[in-house]
Amino acid sequence: GGTAEKWEETELDQLFSGPLPGRLPVNHRPFSAPHSSRDQLPPPQTGRSHPAHTAAPQVTSTASKLLPPVAFNHTIGHIVLSEHKNVKFNCSINIPNTYQETAGISWWKDGKELLGAHHSITQFYPDEEGVSIIALFSIASVQRSDNGSYFCKMKVNNREIVSDPIYVEVQGLPYFIKQPESVNVTRNTAFNLTCQAVGPPEPVNIFWVQNSSRVNEKPERSPSVLTVPGLTETAVFSCEAHNDKGLTVSKGVHINIKVIPSPPTEVHILNSTAHSILVSWVPGFDGYSPLQNCSIQVKEADRLSNGSVMVFNTSASPHLYEIQQLQALANYSIAVSCRNEIGWSAVSPWILASTTEGAPSVAPLNITVFLNESNNILDIRWTKPPIKRQDGELVGYRISHVWESAGTYKELSEEVSQNGSWAQIPVQIHNATCTVRIAAITKGGIGPFSEPVNIIIPEHSKVDYAPSSTPAPGNTDSM
């Protein structure tokens, strides 16, 4: 083993703890190749009739079973160093010429092959008896993620040879694997915060800090759970993690006290009809607790009326509600409130909204229909219905007249202005029944139709006096 300081910034050859090939001449220069692939070969060597990785002379497969075992030389077992330092280590092996088919050395960490961007160099030292191979591995500015067990692998004569592990331990300040998290809590209600930090070096001790003051006098071994009995106001918590290398402070987290929401803002009337108002709003601050539902309060805005408040409950989203079953042509005061688990917000400032005028609620009365045969017209008369103020201003009438005879059906309608209470329509079909219904119209819409009044239209010149009808629903009067 060793200590971090001992191995930091150490030269490559100082790390060769296995025996170097003593048979190499002093002036012999090894062949070197950056090692980025497990099968990289050394360059061809002059004076040899075979590549360095292939043993010579050739031997039979039976003979290979009798070859002496080949193993990696022993090397450093444990390297301890601080974060951000550089580290270099190696493994080496001597391959006699009697071996055939050797592959390059590959580096592995914690059971997984290291491919790609790792910095490794393989050096070959050939001589008459065989080849010595040294695989060098370096890591610049080590991080915690470089911690682990490194080893070399090589295939010799189809047999896998594995080196002893080199355990790299990167030490540094404590590293948080679980930091306290912001939570929203009910006033005076207990809650827990968790803090966990690791080395190496271990142990890691935890101090809790609330609003810049330490909570615990004695440190707790990581992981630590702090139980806070309850708060009355927002606080900031953090934890300090200490080990032999120093201290690390976690992020500070806000612990918010749940309160009632702020009232909704921007209450707007999006649309009004005779009997409904569509209202929208922007929710206020939620008080650190999700809004559960909202309440729309509605009351008649007439200062002299003593109408009670109507309350409509709706979900917190969408921020929209259609208030229904309202009176036509009326003013209403509207306010919105929303609630979370703590309670209801104040109501928004009251706003005023108006419904539009409605359609008439009653049909024209006393409908009579006369046939003016000489002019070939129907003369229709009625009485204006009693229209309430909220029904709006009368703008006219709609007359529906349906003509039926054998094999013929004709449905027509006319609109007439409100001036007067009579109308004339031309006869459409003879030898037929005509059914007349009338509805009043205001800006708010069309009202209900009157009960049908039927009149029989005879064939041409069969009568010389005017038939008439009276509003007896469903009856046919002909004269």
Epitope: I260, H268, R303, S337, V347, P349, L352
Partner: antibody, heavy 116, light 111 residues
Framework: EVQLQQSGPELVKPGASVRIPCKAS????????MDWVKQSHGKSLEWIGN????????IYSQKFKGKATLTVDKSSSTAYMELRSLTSEDTAVYYC?????????WGQGTLVTVSA | DIVLTQSPASLTVSLGQRATISCRAS??????????MHWYQQKPGQPPKLLIY???NLESGVPARFSGSRSGTDFTLNIHPVEEEDAATYYC?????????FGSGTKLEIK
Amino acid sequence: EVQLQQSGPELVKPGASVRIPCKASGYTFSDYNMDWVKQSHGKSLEWIGNINPNIGGTIYSQKFKGKATLTVDKSSSTAYMELRSLTSEDTAVYYCARGDYGFASWGQGTLVTVSA
Amino acid sequence: DIVLTQSPASLTVSLGQRATISCRASRSVSTSGYSYMHWYQQKPGQPPKLLIYLASNLESGVPARFSGSRSGTDFTLNIHPVEEEDAATYYCQHSREYPFTFGSGTKLEIK
């Protein structure tokens, strides 16, 4: 007729608290907010906040958060405002007013004097 | 907060003449066709009395010589003809959003 009846004047010591009642009559108490307004001597009017008796929701002007607490007792149609940690700055007439668009009905006011 | 700037601070008007008091809002107090500005009259030792609500609506029981109008974010209270009993301090107030605020007041004197 809508009436809001407030209590008489209060003389309190600095640091103490006071609770001012406002009894409503002549209308359905829960149908209207109860707003509270402060008027220091010779000064303008300051809106303190309001409470909706229907749901108990309260809102306060930032200046009066922590100073005033509004509550209601629906059974007696009475609204209350508690003022705490009183200082000479809190010496004023305090009014309750029935909330709507425009305060059409006001209490007669309660004079709170803070003096050692 | 919406700031209401009231002017003038004091005003002296002859009996029978017109008194005009202005109130300017720092931003709009109107929405959905209504302006949430109100006018009050206050006499010494009494609570304020609502005169005009929603910028131009005369409160029940208030004499018709009081009227209110709006132009953008400028609101005006007119009293014409002024009577002796109109000597008082007048305040504007909005209820468009929280917090509600009042103007600083205009003291009207009659000569």
